[in-house]
């Protein structure tokens, strides 16, 4: 079995990726410039730290979280980095074109890099459902389509519903999940006989996936608070996210043990359930008025996550062809919906408390936003799935799914893995 790329992909990928990179460089040259008004260098460093947290989450957290496959760990980490690097560049340009361009050049600030990193994170969440079944050329397409779809969704929501940066970015959980699931649904599903072992997890990669989960766990408060307007809101977001993820860890480990007949703890459950609280509080993290509410939400999210991890993979594997260990997609779809519902409940409480009689209208707006996010995610996901099925991308043969050796040079291995 040759470990080389098929000849056509060897021609296609570098040409496609480098042409795209050259185009991006030209766009940056003609249409962007840096914010020249930075007065306070100390403040600049503090502001950069948030962006740094987001980059760590994306590159290390999500990179390693998806690396638990026995024979696909290298590709998971490196492809994630590739997608992040490409996604951030395109997201900065797209956000600039959509929000600033009429006034002239796109001004690049630390905030725009923050936004772009979060947009690229969406792709890294979605791709969990398809990693191992696609090559880098296909992933480039997925990055471009998803970042474009999310950017446009955010602009539409911002313009129609007048939502702030935090709110329209927090649809990322639901959007990324449904996008990834709809792409997966379009890809060839059955694994041929004899390759089932490749989508199993192994101890060393599972440990690195746990490392990814730990990085995400540590930095999730930064993610949920990154786009908030005032320090008091950011403080609330950090605290509430921290309480929620703390409780979801306890729930994940104990719930996993409870779900197993012999009381054993499943690595796969824990990888994803430790993050459950962070996803569930995302939308309303700055609004939750007291810690116990965030903790209850973390508990519920942890239970949903463990329950989902136990009962949904069978269905997802049959219908969508998603391997048992790639549970981020349906996990985030459930928890994202939970988060949106919590936000709507809090809005109702706010409206009732203020006695302003606008409950129906507020709920309608929120449901409209959520529905729009899901519809655009599904439509753009299906479009991406159809694009990825085109022959020009030379997708890996189904017998080579979840195989690092298709993509990587291993000098110490002549054949096999």
């Amino acid at each position: 079995m040759s470990s080389k790329y098929p000849r056509s992909v060897r021609r296609c990928l570098p040409l496609w990726a480098l042409t795209l990179e050259a185009a991006l460089i030209l766009l940056f040259y003609f249409f962007t410039h840096y914010d020249a008004s930075l007065e306070d260098q100390k403040g600049l460093v503090a502001s950069y730290q948030v962006g740094q947290d987001l980059t760590v989450m994306a590159a290390i957290g999500l990179g390693f979280l998806t690396s638990s496959f026995r024979r696909h760990s290298w590709s998971s980490v490196a492809f994630n980095l590739f997608m992040l690097a490409l996604g951030v560049q395109w997201a900065i340009l797209l956000d600039g074109f959509l929000s600033q361009f009429p006034s002239g050049k796109v001004v690049i600030t630390l905030f725009s890099i923050r936004l772009a990193t979060m947009s690229a994170l969406s792709v890294l969440i979605s791709v969990d459902a398809v990693l191992g079944k696609v090559n880098l050329a296909q992933l480039v397409v997925m990055v471009l389509v998803e970042v474009t779809a999310l950017g446009n969704l955010r602009m539409v929501i911002s313009n129609i519903f007048n939502t702030d940066y935090h709110m329209n970015m927090m649809h990322i959980y639901v959007f990324a999940a449904y996008f990834g699931l709809s792409v997966a649904w379009c890809l060839p599903k059955p694994l041929p006989e004899g390759t089932e072992d490749k989508d199993q997890t192994a101890t060393i990669p599972s440990l690195s996936a746990m490392l990814g989960a730990l990085f995400l766990w540590m930095f999730w408060p930064s993610f949920n608070s990154a786009l908030l307007r005032s320090p008091i809101e950011r403080k609330n977001a950090v605290f509430n996210t921290y309480y929620a993820v703390a409780v979801s860890v306890v729930t994940a480990i104990s719930g996993s043990s409870l779900a197993h007949p012999q009381g054993k703890i499943s690595k796969t459950y824990v990888h994803s359930a430790v993050l459950a609280g962070g996803v569930a509080v995302g939308t309303s993290c700055h609004l939750i008025p007291s810690p116990w509410l965030a903790m209850v939400l973390g508990l519920v999210a942890g239970l949903i996550s463990v329950g989902g991890a136990k009962y949904l993979p069978g269905c997802c594997n049959r219908v969508l062809g998603i391997p048992h260990s790639s549970i981020m997609g349906y996990n985030f779809s459930l928890l994202g919906l939970l988060g949106e519902i919590i936000y709507i409940v809090l809005l109702v409480l706010d409206t009732v408390g203020a006695g302003n009689g606008m409950i129906g209208f507020q709920v309608l707006l929120s449901i409209g936003e959520l529905s729009l996010a899901i519809v655009i995610a599904l439509m753009s996901g299906l479009l991406t799935g159809l694009l990825l099925n085109l022959k020009i991308w030379k997708a890996p043969h189904e017998a080579k799914y979840f195989d690092d050796q298709v993509f990587w040079k291993f000098p110490h291995l002549a054949v096999g893995f």
Partner: antibody, heavy 125, light 107 residues
């Protein structure tokens, strides 16, 4: 005492530039968003620009976008407004104001609770 | 941008009168509405935030109501120091906007 003091106003020719400053005292400057608001002679208030507490985000009214730049130096407790390509219609009293976030029942609401005394900018040939 | 329209643009009233000023938004702004008072040659002063919450230090004769599109500022019993111009302002969107102002004069 919480105080905002604007400076830098004056008479300037159309097309020229001017930089306004707003010195803050009596509160923790780096935890508040800051705004510039102007008032043309005999006219109402017009919101001009805002900068977030950490300087990470800025917004401008359409009438000044691309010409005015808001910035802040948290180490000096100072807010700035760099005004380029000035026009006659930019003649006004310019106020800086502090943004406060106040919790409602659940949500946060924003208002400008502290204002400076204003500095006059006259654009005339 | 959201347009804010105040009415009336000016009114004459006597000390002790009940005065009502209305503000209408071009689209729903929930309760993201503030009221300011400005006296000639002075900086504006925050009276009401979040449509109906009284800013500390502001007399209780001032009150605000409304949500969505229509809002009202009421002065229950006009005092000599209340003769000024009043502005509504929305903070619902990132680009804030003021109403054109209502001048309250002595009859």
């Amino acid at each position: 005492e919480v105080q905002l003091v604007e400076s830098g106003g004056g008479v300037v020719q159309p097309g020229r530039s001017l930089r306004l400053s707003c010195a803050a005292s009596g509160f923790t400057f780096n935890t508040y968003g800051m705004h510039w608001v102007r008032q043309a002679p005999g006219k109402g208030l017009e919101w001009v620009a805002v900068i977030w507490y950490d300087g990470s985000n800025k917004y401008y009214a359409d009438s000044v976008k691309g010409r005015f730049t808001i910035s802040r130096d948290n180490s000096k407790n100072t807010l700035y407004l760099q005004m380029n390509s000035l026009r006659a219609e930019d003649t006004a009293v310019y106020y800086c104001a502090r943004e406060v976030a106040v919790r409602g029942v659940i949500r946060y609401y924003y208002a400008m609770d502290v204002w400076g005394q204003g500095t006059t900018v006259t654009v005339s040939s | 941008d959201i347009q804010m329209t105040q009415s009336p643009s000016s009114l004459s009233a006597s000390v002790g009168d009940r005065v009502t000023i209305t503000c209408r938004a071009s689209q729903s702004i929930s309760s993201y509405l503030n009221w300011y008072q400005q006296k000639p040659g002075k900086a504006p002063k925050l009276l009401i935030y979040a449509a109906s919450s009284l800013q500390s230090g502001v007399p209780s004769r001032f009150s605000g109501s409304g949500s969505g599109i229509d809002f009202t500022l009421t002065i229950s019993s006009l005092q000599p120091e209340d003769f000024a111009t009043y502005y509504c302002q929305q903070s619902y969107t990132t680009l804030w906007t003021f109403g054109q102002g209502t001048k309250v004069e002595i009859k």
